[in-house]
């Protein structure tokens, strides 16, 4: 049920910080039904930690990248690792946390005006649109400059929330990331119990909009801890 999904708090317990929604560390991100783990193991907890196996960066969360957990380790065994903060060493853009990119082997802050056409990311066939719209097709390509001239509308592929138009955030959807609506008052959200605890939510929803926070719905106060419903509410 929706309640069981919302309150499962899927946690991978990878090295902190996993942060919140893309571009908004610590923000509450609502889990939609469909948090995907291999073998259908949907609700992992700290007590039941299993590293999330991956083949490429797109299969990891917005604040993670795919790599071997040991330096020079077996390339065949890769898991999702926490992204690297500013000034940390990197080999590619995906290794750096949101708001940063890899330059000369170091994660540096992304200047939003800086042309990022060189960033590699899985995007999809454009079907003639300025902003590539989603396709089941997965391919590595270089983003063209036109993708950064205008902000992405809902459904446009994105790298960061800053790529999306006002009122949208960049959230994971299947094996892509797209611009989705920021949550409005009354919409369901997930309040993660500890900072950095949000796992790989393949169907992320955005964080709560301005002036709203993710709190237990009033009429759910009496409910057990496992069935508390959180919604976006006025501060």
């Amino acid at each position: 049920t929706l309640n069981s999904v919302l309150n499962s708090n899927a946690i991978k317990n990878l090295p902190p910080p996993l942060g919140g929604a893309a571009g908004h560390p610590g923000s509450a991100v609502s889990a939609a039904p469909g948090i995907l783990y291999p073998g259908g193991n949907k609700y992992q907890t700290i007590d039941n930690y299993q590293p999330y196996p991956c083949a490429e960066d797109e299969e990891c969360g917005t604040d993670e990248y795919c790599a071997s957990p040991t330096r020079g380790g077996d390339a065949g065994v890769q898991i999702c690792l926490a992204c690297r903060k500013r000034r940390k060493r990197c080999m590619r853009h995906a290794m750096c946390c949101p708001g940063n990119y890899c330059k000369n082997g170091i994660c540096v802050s992304s200047d939003q005006n800086h042309f990022r056409g060189e960033i590699e990311e899985t995007i999809t066939e454009s079907f003639g649109n300025d902003h590539s719209t989603l396709d089941g097709y997965s391919r590595r390509t270089t983003l063209s400059s036109k993708m950064y001239h205008t902000k992405g509308q809902e459904g446009s592929v994105c790298l960061r929330s800053s790529d999306c138009a006002s009122g949208l955030c960049c959230a994971r959807h299947f094996w892509s990331k797209i611009c989705k609506p920021v949550l409005k008052e009354g919409q369901v959200c997930t309040k993660h119990r500890r900072k950095g605890s949000h796992g790989l939510e393949i169907f992320q929803r955005c964080y709560c909009g301005e002036g709203l926070s993710c709190r237990i719905q009033k009429d759910h106060h009496q409910a057990s801890n496992s069935s508390r419903l959180h919604t976006c509410q006025r501060h």
Partner: antibody, heavy 118, light 107 residues
Framework: EVQLLESGGGLVQPGGSLRLSCAAS????????VSWVRQAPGKGLEWVSS????????EYADSVKGRFTISRDNSKNTLYLQMNSLRAEDTAVYYC???????????WGQGTLVTVSS | DIQMTQSPSSLSASVGDRVTITCKAS??????LTWYQQKPGKAPKLLIY???TLQRGVPSRFSGSGSGTDFTLTISSLQPEDFATYYC?????????FGQGTKVEIK
């Protein structure tokens, strides 16, 4: 030409197992997510399971979770559905389908009939 | 789960008629809405994706509209080969869900 061809259906007793296969051709199979969708006789379409292009993650309908396993072998261009602990309500035509734009299912196989009956 | 409700469940129409089928989602799904046509004994065929984009090879008499929760499939001038069952499907989140179908029959 994109083609998906299911096989492995048949008559099985309740509690039994079957393994469905879906052979893909005419496109680069490893670049696409794929799904299984079923249709009980005279009924509508029901999504069963999905798998990502690399096979890195899977997802299942609640009705089959813990009993069915989706997998793929990209070197053989083949999708699989291992079905265990089959029930009468699993009786349906099973289709494999490829994800296309906006994650609609743009190409479907012809289907394979699974009948669960004693 | 997001519920998809189609209406009507069936309709009778004549060749040349304009036919409209509606699909309502129980929650916001943006434009993640696909329409399919299915004929007896055959696999479904994708007609429209992203709520309003016509799939290559599909006749232009088919059109789709809507966004968010309310969607429409329109056949501008019904042809003999269009008598079939039509399904909508959302792919905004899993479980992927289909409408119950609309059967278009000959009057």
């Amino acid at each position: 030409e994109v083609q998906l061809l299911e096989s492995g259906g048949g008559l099985v007793q309740p509690g039994g197992s079957l393994r469905l296969s879906c052979a893909a051709s005419g496109f680069t199979f490893s670049n696409y997510g794929v799904s299984w969708v079923r249709q009980a006789p005279g009924k509508g379409l029901e999504w069963v399971s999905s798998i990502s292009p690399s096979g890195g993650w899977t997802e299942y309908a609640d009705s089959v979770k813990g009993r069915f396993t989706i997998s793929r072998d990209n070197s053989k261009n083949t999708l699989y559905l291992q079905m265990n602990s089959l029930r009468a309500e699993d009786t349906a035509v099973y289709y494999c389908a490829r994800y296309g734009a906006y994650f609609g299912l743009d190409y479907w196989g012809q289907g394979t009939l699974v009948t669960v009956s004693s | 789960d997001i519920q998809m409700t189609q209406s009507p469940s069936s309709l009778s129409a004549s060749v040349g008629d304009r036919v409209t089928i509606t699909c309502k989602a129980s929650d916001h799904i943006g434009k993640f809405l696909t329409w399919y046509q299915q004929k007896p004994g055959k696999a479904p065929k994708l007609l429209i994706y992203a709520a309003s984009t016509l799939q290559r090879g599909v006749p232009s008499r088919f059109s789709g509209s809507g966004s968010g929760t309310d969607f429409t499939l329109t056949i501008s001038s019904l042809q003999p080969e269009d008598f079939a069952t039509y399904y909508c499907q959302q792919s905004y989140e899993t479980p992927l869900t289909f409408g119950q179908g609309t059967k278009v029959e000959i009057k």
